[in-house]
Amino acid sequence: MMTGTIETTGNISAEKGGSIILQCHLSSTTAQVTQVNWEQQDQLLAICNADLGWHISPSFKDRVAPGPGLGLTLQSLTVNDTGEYFCIYHTYPDGTYTGRIFLEVLESSVAEHGARFQIP
């Protein structure tokens, strides 16, 4: 039985040209995390593996930095970065937990952080 929950940074907004930290936290489970994937829609952004460390997809290498922790920092944001992002926690023995973040990149200077929410 999967008992864990993922807390994410929720719905967030940021300014064009700026940077943003995407974060997920897996809690309420004793399962061991073996890998965390970060995806944007169907594109793989980055992987952090227990044995191999971080791998950033070549097409995002210039604009994506790992961390802090298991989070991901997106830099030099463009309006095209608006959309859904997913953190996928691979665990043993539970299996896979997925968290969703929606990022809106704004042209103006009125970007504000959205509220946090939990995904069971």
């Epitope: 936290h25 191999l52 460390g53 790992p66 298991l70």
Partner: antibody
Framework: QVQLQQPGSELVRPGASVKLSCKAS????????MHWVKQRHGQGLEWIGN????????NYDEKFKNKGTLTVDTSSSTAYIHLSSLTSEDSAVYYC??????????WGQGTTLTVSS | DIVLTQSPATLSVTPGDSVSLSCRAS??????LHWFQQKSHESPRLLIK???QSISGIPSRFSGSGSGTDFTLSINSLETEDFGMYFC?????????FGGGTKLEIK
């Protein structure tokens, strides 16, 4: 096996600068953050900053921004910390330690830096 | 910056005793809390990751609990090799920070 090798000690004069090294082996150097931690004699651990060798991205504690500079040489899998304008306050053990899926699973033995005239 | 406060600063105990060490964060760090042991003239050693997750090679008498801002490292039936310094550390945000440490000494 994973190893982080650091020189045992360095003796430098006040006002001088020093470059401490940390040679990594047994893993893919560019896939893990390298952190530097300071420990004065008998004191706690202070996080100086980190560098991601895959891109050169760095983060520093504000306290060390004008004191230390982190660099890497990916060809030799070596991380460096350059410490400048040294005073007795900089005398300490400096550790390198890596972070992947979780922080600080492997540590160097530490370099004891002594600043003395 | 996130401040981690450890208590007590020193704990004098007898081998065989069980102890709990506290680490309190100045703001929520969710589950991004790790514990380290350091013996004299040695590098720190990772004991527990992400609050309570075990580390290969670390005895099962070490366990962690807590969430948000309050965390505890528990050591059951202390052995002589367990005496030394214990530090908590957060990886929720940069700059990463350590607690001031708890010294576990033999009574």
């Amino acid at each position: 096996q994973v190893q982080l090798q650091q020189p045992g000690s360095e003796l430098v004069r006040p006002g001088a600068s020093v470059k401490l090294s940390c040679k990594a082996s047994g893993y893919t150097f560019t896939s893990y953050w390298m952190h530097w931690v300071k420990q004065r004699h008998g004191q706690g651990l202070e996080w100086i900053g980190n560098i991601y060798p895959g891109s050169g991205t760095t983060n520093y504690d504000e306290k060390f921004k004008n004191k230390g500079t982190l660099t890497v040489d990916t060809s030799s899998s070596t991380a460096y910390i350059h410490l400048s304008s040294l005073t007795s306050e900089d005398s300490a053990v400096y550790y390198c330690t890596r972070e992947g899926l979780y922080p600080f699973d492997y540590w160097g033995q530490g370099t004891t830096l002594t600043v003395s005239s | 910056d996130i401040v981690l406060t450890q208590s007590p600063a020193t704990l004098s105990v007898t081998p065989g005793d069980s102890v709990s060490l506290s680490c309190r964060a100045s703001q929520s760090i969710r589950n991004s809390l790790h514990w380290f042991q350091q013996k004299s003239h040695e590098s720190p050693r990772l004991l527990i990751k992400y609050v309570f997750q075990s580390i290969s090679g670390i005895p099962s008498r070490f366990s962690g609990s807590g969430s948000g801002t309050d965390f505890t490292l528990s050591i059951n039936s202390l052995e002589t090799e367990d005496f030394g310094m214990y530090f908590c550390q957060q990886s929720n945000s940069w700059p990463y920070t350590f607690g001031g440490g708890t010294k576990l000494e033999i009574k």
